[in-house]
Interface confidence: medium
């Protein structure tokens, strides 16, 4: 493998917890500018497993507002526009990294945290358990 | 909005870029322990809009490897197990925060970055454009 030399311009850390505590620049760089701007914004209504979006706010967290998907039905919408309970609407979940103020209310000290959010829903064939 | 008093025990910051550059504890806290442990891990195969996972690696990013969902078909799987092209499989995308080493190769200095990832796929009714 390539041996990466340590950059001589790196910040020095004399923190006894190093490298648990590091400096992070919050001037967020967005790498999405070249991606397809067509986002999944209307899929929640057009999906065969439609979902609603619920606002989750926490001022001690960055990002403070997270929108969570909740599937509208247990089943999926069929060609007639009715709910088919032989199929299941299930949330697609994703872990995301967030920053939590620690100690609370501190503007410049955070802890990385993993939280699980539901991004949308998909329609799946159910797992049927046959009883002998 | 509510004014949150500054905690007197906060670390002091004399950084001229404050509060752009902050201290972050990397001992990642997992808030998911009390959530339903049922993971969406097998949905990629059971969905009517199934997807495959593709590897994207960047050693200067955390997490370094991101597996992206790519829908297997343009259409959706119908009750007979065939692809129905009257419906569309579409990716559900979500922005996530990642950490990038900055300057490069520094083990204790990072920048937050937002990237768009495809988490899974859902089946939607197509938008039909009628030509007059």
């Amino acid at each position: 493998g390539i041996t990466i030399p340590r950059n001589p311009g790196c910040p020095n850390s004399e923190d006894k917890n190093f490298p648990r505590t590091v400096m992070v620049n919050l001037n967020i760089h967005n790498r999405n500018t070249n991606t397809n701007p067509k986002r999944s914004s209307d899929y929640y209504n057009r999906s065969t497993s439609p979902w609603n979006l619920h606002r989750n706010e926490d001022p001690e967290r960055y990002p403070s507002v997270i929108w969570e998907a909740k599937c509208r039905h247990l089943g999926c919408i069929n060609a007639d526009g009715n709910v088919d309970y032989h199929m299941n609407s299930v949330p697609i979940q994703q872990e995301i990294l967030v920053l939590r103020r620690e100690p609370p209310h501190c503007p410049n000290s955070f802890r990385l945290e993993k939280i699980l959010v539901s991004v949308g829903c998909t329609c799946v064939t159910p797992i049927v358990h046959h009883v002998a | 909005g509510i004014t949150i008093p500054r905690n007197p025990g906060c670390p002091n910051s004399e950084d001229k870029n404050f509060p752009r550059t902050v201290m972050v504890n990397l001992n990642i806290h997992n808030r998911n322990t009390n959530t339903n442990p049922k993971r969406s891990s097998d949905y990629y195969n059971r969905s009517t809009s199934p997807w495959n996972l593709h590897r994207n690696e960047d050693p200067e990013r955390y997490p370094s490897v991101i597996w992206e969902a790519k829908c297997r078909h343009l259409g959706c799987i119908n009750a007979d197990g065939n692809v129905d092209y009257h419906m569309n499989s579409v990716p559900i995308q979500q922005e996530i925060l990642v950490l990038r080493r900055e300057p490069p190769h520094c083990p204790n200095s990072f920048r937050l970055e937002k990237i768009l990832v495809s988490v899974g796929c859902t089946c939607v009714t197509p938008i039909v454009h009628h030509v007059a």
Epitope: G1, K114 | P63, W67
Partner: antibody
Framework: EVQLVQSGAEVKKPGSSVKISCKAS????????ISWVRQAPGQGLEWMGG????????DYAQKFQGRVTITADESTTTAYMELSGLTSDDTAVYYC???????????????????WGQGTTVTVSS | EIVLTQSPDFQSVTPKEKVTITCRAS??????LHWYQQKPGQSPKLLIK???YSSSGVPSRFSGSGSGTDFTLTINGLEAEDAGTYYC?????????FGQGTKVGIK
């Protein structure tokens, strides 16, 4: 080709310490962590702890907490495991294993061990 | 910690036969279950990751299934070179834990 090459066999006295190295090549060192797993003679596999090379952060199994120290040197792409207070129960083959830091199917996963070192035999005997 | 229990402990099989090894977790681990093969005097080798994904270069006769608490490793058409000990491993919760191993012998 990914390779993990470990240091040679060690014979140690009870109460002493041992430090084993694991030199990684092929692939980017920061794209994975290194875990240490041991196997006593005729026994199964036991995870001791690991390090995430990207941050240098470590996790240890409670059984070894306070006795094991895992470090990594990014400049030489080498990980180290030091075990102190050795007893005869620590006689085992010690393996380093590569653990990718991945965002898998929607999760920040702790992972499979996709490549393993050849093993280092440590014998503790008076 | 999560306890993984494999069965059987030992299996003696004729070449070309199908081998099934099960691994049961003491609690739900989603799909974070991996399978390794270890031949005598060698390091373990990853066969299956995340319950059902084959590691690169692993013969197609090896497959994995299951989620939650019950998992299966299947060898469809055992070959002589498949003799060894098979371990399951969970990475859902720290500490990582392994099953006690299943030794597969050739008749």
């Amino acid at each position: 080709e990914v390779q993990l090459v470990q240091s040679g066999a060690e014979v140690k006295k009870p109460g002493s310490s041992v430090k084993i190295s694991c030199k990684a090549s092929g692939g980017s060192f920061t794209s994975y962590g290194i875990s240490w797993v041991r196997q006593a003679p005729g026994q199964g596999l036991e995870w001791m702890g690991g390090i995430t090379n990207f941050f240098g952060s470590t996790d240890y199994a409670q059984k070894f907490q306070g006795r094991v120290t895992i470090t990594a040197d990014e400049s030489t792409t080498t990980a180290y495991m030091e075990l102190s207070g050795l007893t005869s129960d620590d006689t085992a083959v010690y393996y380093c294993a590569r653990e990718p830091n991945e965002f898998w199917n929607g999760y920040f996963a702790t992972n499979d061990f996709d490549y393993w070192g050849q093993g280092t035999t440590v014998t503790v005997s008076s | 910690e999560i306890v993984l229990t494999q069965s059987p402990d030992f299996q003696s099989v004729t070449p070309k036969e199908k081998v099934t090894i099960t691994c049961r977790a003491s609690q739900n681990i989603g799909s974070e279950l991996h399978w390794y093969q270890q031949k005598p005097g060698q390091s373990p080798k990853l066969l299956i990751k995340y319950a059902s994904y084959s590691s690169s270069g692993v013969p197609s006769r090896f497959s994995g299934s299951g989620s939650g608490t019950d998992f299966t490793l299947t060898i469809n058409g055992l070959e002589a070179e498949d003799a060894g000990t098979y371990y399951c491993h969970q990475s859902s919760c720290l500490p990582h834990t392994f099953g006690q191993g299943t030794k597969v012998g050739i008749k």
